[in-house]
């Protein structure tokens, strides 16, 4: 469940170094304690690693992918799984470990040489790719310092968010991706159910601006669930 | 390793608001969780907000939700801390910090590995 995943006893790390006038908060040397967490939380091992519950790709680390783990995926939360390396089947690119990305089902490098011309096939032929990453560091990073000079400008072809400039991000229209406005207070917006109903969207909206939540309007409260209008609000 | 450098700090009066910038170098800071820490004279350092590689992720401390909103540009590898209604009790050095973010977990639990040195916020009453 939900709870069992978050509510976890992984053994946890000591925090970084905090280094006072003579020490050096730069450094990643040996621990030391002293940072307050909320809860008592300090670190996770990777030796421990527990699964976190996610709703979006975007939500996992970069070396994750948000799937449910069973493999009907039809089985309540999606977690956060691990990414596959080269050679394994997939559905798209988020799926497949930094330095690769889905094509024809199968991560594969991410070849510069090749890349700018298979990656604009792979845009138009997956319509599954949700949220689509490809550059050789980590599939999180940008993609456009690679490959693009500038940012992709509104409506211009995208793969993920950072290919886009600011204030836009790379949201699905028909098959391929474009880069759309992030949605401003009161615009409407698509507050996902953790069963990645997002991967059916032809029309994908961007997320809310910064400081914005995606949240029940308070006049559709008493709405069925089914026409609930969510709107970019305040914190 | 990836370098740290923290501004925008400065004195502001009770109910004011300053925004917090932290830019880096030297790594891949799109692929890295950011922290921001505060120390406040006499008092252990302590875990204010962290937002994950994407955006996508947002933690708060209980004491400074609805007034602290925390932001990245990937693009200009910066990450954002806007303080509105500044309270005395806010005054700390503020320090940005950043780890890997290749498996996710809750926000305060992550290893922060780099460090800035901190930017000091003076709020008077």
């Known amino acids: 469940t939900l709870n069992s995943v978050l509510n976890s006893n992984a053994i946890k790390n000591l925090p970084p170094p905090l280094g006072g006038a003579a020490g050096h908060p730069g450094s990643a040397v040996s621990a030391a304690p002293g940072i307050l967490y909320p809860g008592g939380n300090k670190y996770q091992t990777i030796d421990n690693y527990q699964p976190y519950p996610c709703a979006e790709d975007e939500e996992c680390g970069t070396d994750e992918y948000c799937a449910s783990p069973t493999r009907g995926g039809d089985a309540g939360v999606q977690i956060c799984l691990a990414c596959r390396k080269r050679r394994k089947r997939c559905m798209r690119h988020a799926m497949c470990c930094p330095g690769n990305y889905c094509k024809n089902g199968i991560c594969v490098s991410s070849d510069q040489n090749h890349f700018r011309g298979e990656i604009e096939e792979t845009i138009t032929e997956s319509f599954g790719n949700d949220h689509s990453t490809l550059d050789g560091y980590s599939r999180r990073t940008t993609l456009s310092s690679k490959m693009y000079h500038t940012k992709g400008q509104e409506g211009s072809v995208c793969l993920r968010s950072s290919d886009c400039a600011s204030g836009l991000c790379c949201a699905r229209h028909f098959w391929s991706k474009i880069c759309k406005p992030v949605l401003k207070e009161g615009q409407v917006c698509t507050k996902h159910r953790r069963k990645g109903s997002h991967g059916l969207e032809i029309f994908q909206r961007c997320y809310c601006g910064e400081g914005l939540s995606c949240r029940i309007q308070k006049d559709h409260h008493q709405a069925s669930n089914s026409s609930r209008l969510h709107t970019c609000q305040r914190h | 390793e990836v370098q740290l450098v923290e501004s925008g700090g400065g004195l502001v009066q009770a109910g004011g608001s300053l925004r917090l910038s932290c830019t880096a170098s030297?790594?891949?800071?799109?692929?890295?969780?950011v922290g921001w820490f505060r120390q406040a004279p006499g008092k252990e350092r302590e875990f204010v907000t962290g937002?994950?590689?994407?955006?996508?992720?947002?933690y708060y401390a209980d004491s400074v939700k609805g007034r602290f909103t925390i932001s990245r540009d990937n693009a200009k590898d910066t990450a954002y801390l806007e303080m509105n209604s500044l309270k005395p009790e806010d005054t700390a050095v503020y320090y940005c910090?950043?780890?890997?973010?290749?498996?996710?977990?809750?926000?305060?639990?992550?290893?922060?590995?780099?460090w800035g040195q901190g930017t000091q916020v003076t709020v008077s009453s």
């Open positions: 910090a950043s780890g890997r973010d290749r498996y996710a977990r809750a926000l305060p639990d992550y290893e922060y590995l780099w």
């Open positions: 030297g790594g891949a800071f799109s692929s890295t969780v």
């Open positions: 937002i994950n590689w994407s955006g996508a992720r947002t």
